[in-house]
Structures are given as C-alpha cells and as structure tokens.
C-alpha cells in the first residue's frame, strides 16, 4: 500500500546516510552535478541533477526514492529554476548537502 510521507522521507535519509558512510572511492567517480536551492520543489530538482550522472550504481536507490516525491517525470537535461546553474559540485557533496537539509525537514515534521 501507499507509504506515509514520513516513512518515505526517513527511508531516503537512511539511504543517504548509507551512501555517505559506505563511500570508499570517490562517489560516482567524482562526477559533478548542478547545485540546487534547497527549497520547495527541491526533490524534483535534486533528481534532475542526479539523473544526469551516468553509470553510478550507488545512487540508483536514491534516484528511485526521489522519484516518489516528484509528481512529474524527470528527464536528463531538464532544469528547473531551483538549479544554481553556475555552480557544479561533486555528487558526494550534493548528497551530504541534501542529507543535512532532509534531516532538518524531518526534525521539523515537514514530510512533503
């Protein structure tokens, strides 16, 4: 059945924690992605950034989980206004930034 938003957010946080803790080699071979503004609509924006990373099995689960928060289908090369188009960061840093923000949302009870 449907997963409550609080559960989905907790599972996403757990997966991001797992990625950061189990990171041995550079995540996704050091691939760079567009930074995003961590505001409303950030789930789709995050997926829009990560979807452009190719051949990185470590983030497949994260991408799937993010799709559960995004009502529209995301395509490679698609960019929302939430992207900071002049700033690219490594996937590892992107994941850490996203994780910190999601933990804050979870603590505040903001699950959508």
């Amino acid at each position: 059945g449907p997963v409550p938003p609080s559960t989905a957010l907790r599972e996403l946080i757990e997966e991001l924690v797992n990625i950061t803790q189990n990171q041995k080699a550079p995540l996704c071979n050091g691939s760079m992605v567009w930074s995003i503004n961590l505001t409303a609509g950030m789930y789709c924006a995050a997926l829009e950034s990560l979807i452009n990373v190719s051949g990185c099995s470590a983030i497949e689960k994260t991408q799937r989980m993010l799709s559960g928060f995004c009502p529209h289908k995301v395509s490679a090369g698609q960019f929302s206004s939430l992207h900071v188009r002049d700033t690219k960061i490594e996937v590892a840093q992107f994941v850490k930034d996203l994780l910190l923000h999601l933990k804050k949302l979870f603590r505040e009870g903001r699950f959508n």
């Epitope: 059945g1 449907p2 997963v3 938003p5 989905a8 979807i51 190719s54 051949g55 990185c56 099995s57 470590a58 983030i59 497949e60 689960k61 991408q63 799937r64 989980m65 799709s67 559960g68 928060f69 995004c70 009502p71 289908k73």
Partner: nanobody, 129 residues
Framework: VGQLVESGGGSVQPGGSLRLSCAAP????????IAWFRQSPGKEREWVSC????????IYSDSVKGRFTISRDNTKNMVYLQMNSLNPEDTAVYYC??????????????????????WGQGTQVTVSS
Amino acid sequence: VGQLVESGGGSVQPGGSLRLSCAAPRFTLGSYAIAWFRQSPGKEREWVSCISRSGGDTIYSDSVKGRFTISRDNTKNMVYLQMNSLNPEDTAVYYCATDKRSFCYAPNGLGKGWTYDYWGQGTQVTVSS
C-alpha cells in the same frame, strides 16, 4: 510491435513455479532499469517488481514480496522474474517495461504516475488446479 519480448509463461498448478524472461532485441537491456507489470481480465495493469541497471536496487509489490524474485544477467541482455508459490490470483498477462533509465520509479508516492515508454507484448500465466 513491442520493443521488449517476454517468454516463460504457461499453465501451472497452485504452489508451482515459473520463470519469466525479458529480452530486448533492439537495444541493450543491460543499460536500463526494468519493471514487471501484470494485468488480469477486467483489472487495471498492476506493477509487480523492478530492478535497477546494476541490479543493486530491487523492489516488489506487497502482493508478491517473498514469493517472486527479480534478477538480471547483463552479459546475456536478459531480466528474469522467478515466481514461486503461485496462486490463482497470480493469473494474468505479464509484461516487462523500461523507460531507458538506470533507476526504478517509486511505485508509491507522487512518482507512481510516472509512465514507461517501452513495453513487451506480454506472456500469459495461468494458475489453476
């Protein structure tokens, strides 16, 4: 004509097993996540399972969890659905699908409406005594 080709369907008694296969003659299946769906007469098409490109992420619907196993062999360009402990409610036409993405779509939440663009013609599975 379907972009994907399913095989392995058939008739089986309750409690029996079948292994479905999904192939893609026209593109490299190993580059993409693959999902299985099923549709029984008079019902909507139901999502069953999905496996990511690497095989590291596998998910199942509650109705098949613990009985079905999805796997892939990228060297053979194949994806499989092993179905055990089959019951009459599993009777349906089974389809594999992809959207040429590396990751599975979330079956719940807001992403449940995401569609797959490439489908097979389906293979019939009948479970009856």
